[in-house]
């Protein structure tokens, strides 16, 4: 199988003529040590061609879990889910650019993208790199946890003397602590508002607004549709 | 539908290992999110949770038993396997598996369960 | 680990009463809160999932309400088949716990 025909990611699959977004099945490559996996695509969203890698908008899988469950992903792929660092670090190999959509709970969708976005190995402790922003989300809210180790509430990483994911109740790129926490409480209308510890993007609706909705997608940056 | 039935020993000893089987139909656990947990209730009391293992392999335990326990999952057989180490007669209770859907850790179908008896 | 505490252990009720069962979190679980009801000999039986989501096939005088620490399952009127016992579990982070119980009895 040559390195053209063979399928890595959503985009490949893009190539290859499957437009519908959907559940799928990536094969496993020896090569490159990757075990069969099963991703949602995005084939339409801005030329499609994009691997869904979290989900938040049910709000009834927990997001408050381990080292290990971060690491091998959990939650439901057609539901909220996390793929797993070890599949979004494989992903993100190639060059490759960051989606973030959210949607508040007046029904506004907004969207951050990142030139460049590279997950470091677990030795590296999943470290985030990014590159430019880009998108209508407000301020850049995942700048301040740009070149930041990942932090779960048995793997404290941060660079704070508080544990951040205990503080905020979830798996990410800890700082000191949040200027966004994309993995944090899903809270229903009502408490939405309340919280410090929800799924925050300071850059639009500040600190304590727990988002209704989100989706991190990823794609090559080379992708043409 | 979804079934799952307990099965091993009604009666073990002191010291011995406990090895409870899960056989499940009407799901797959390779299914993403899919997971089956192990629950027990001794006569009388609560209920405890055990374990839980999900369709990726993830395992999950109860830390105050974690030393005790270990999980499997034979996904063709569409079985999974509980075994507990050095049963003390305070483990006498009734055992049960249960079906962690996709959507959330609880638990919507479960077993009929198996009472253990641990006595010499 | 996160402590579930039910209220009352146990309640004497008379059928057409309305019920209310409690249930505190040692810290906030937000809706991550299940209820499951038990029959003598029988296994659980999930009622209402996600702090107020009704299970499929469970009868609508069942609700649940609540979110952050405090839950509360109720029963609209109740039923003779509703003598049981309830347990409230949550699922925010393992280890998943449950609750001690509440023996709803015949008055």
């Known amino acids: 199988q040559t390195s053209a025909d063979a399928i890595y990611d959503c985009s490949s699959l893009y190539q290859k003529n499957y437009r519908i977004s959907g559940v799928y099945r990536l094969p496993s490559n020896d090569f490159l040590g990757s075990p069969e996996l099963e991703v949602f695509c995005d084939m339409e969203t801005k030329g499609g061609g994009w691997t869904v890698i979290q989900r938040r908008k049910s709000g009834l899988v927990s997001f408050y879990r381990d080292w290990k469950q971060y690491k091998q992903g959990f939650g439901s792929i057609r539901g909220d889910f996390w793929l797993g660092n070890e599949h979004i670090h494989r992903l993100s190999r190639q060059p490759t650019r960051l989606r973030v959509e959210m949607e508040d709970w007046e029904g506004t969708v907004r969207y951050a993208e990142y030139s460049h976005f590279v997950l470091s190995n677990e030795l590296n402790s999943y470290r985030l790199f990014l590159g430019n922003y880009s998108g209508n989300a407000g301020n850049d809210a995942l700048y301040y946890h740009n070149n930041t180790a990942f932090s779960t509430k048995d793997k404290d990483n941060d660079n704070c003397l508080d544990k951040c994911a205990q503080l905020r109740k979830g798996g990410y790129w800890y700082n000191c602590c949040t200027d966004s926490n994309l993995n944090g409480v899903y809270y229903r209308l009502g408490e939405h508002d309340k919280h410090l510890d929800g799924i925050t993007w300071y850059g639009w609706h500040g600190a304590n607004y727990s988002l209704k909705r989100v989706e991190m997608k990823i794609r090559p940056e080379d992708f043409k549709p | 539908q979804i079934t799952l039935k307990e099965s091993g020993p009604t009666l073990v000893k002191p010291t011995q290992t406990l090895t409870l089987t899960c056989t499940f139909s009407?799901?797959?656990?390779?299914?993403?999110?899919?997971?089956v947990g192990w629950i027990r209730q001794p006569p009388g009391k609560a209920l405890e949770w055990l374990a839980l293992i999900y369709w990726n392999d993830d395992k999950q335990y109860s830390p105050s038993l974690k030393s005790r326990l270990t999980i499997t999952k034979d996904t063709s057989k569409n079985q999974v396997v509980l075994t507990m180490t050095n049963m003390d007669p305070m483990d006498t209770a009734t055992y049960y598996c249960?079906?962690?859907?996709?959507?959330?850790?609880?638990?919507?179908?479960w077993g009929q369960g198996t009472l253990v008896t641990v006595s010499s | 680990d996160i402590q579930m505490t039910q209220s009352p252990s146990s309640l004497s009720a008379s059928v057409g009463d309305r019920v209310t069962i409690t249930c505190r979190a040692s810290q906030s679980i937000s809706s991550y809160l299940n209820w499951y009801q038990q029959k003598p000999g029988k296994a659980p039986k999930l009622l209402i999932y996600?702090?107020?989501s009704l299970q499929s096939g469970v009868p609508s005088r069942f609700s649940g309400s609540g979110s952050g620490t405090d839950f509360i399952l109720t029963i609209s009127s109740l039923q003779p088949e509703d003598f049981a016992t309830y347990y409230c579990?949550?699922?925010?982070?393992?280890?998943?716990?449950f609750g001690g119980g509440t023996k709803l009895e015949i008055k």
């Open positions: 249960a079906h962690n859907p996709d959507y959330g850790d609880f638990f919507d179908y």
């Open positions: 996600a702090a107020s």
């Open positions: 009407g799901f797959s656990l390779s299914t993403s999110g899919v997971g």
């Open positions: 579990q949550q699922s925010f982070s393992t280890p998943l716990t």
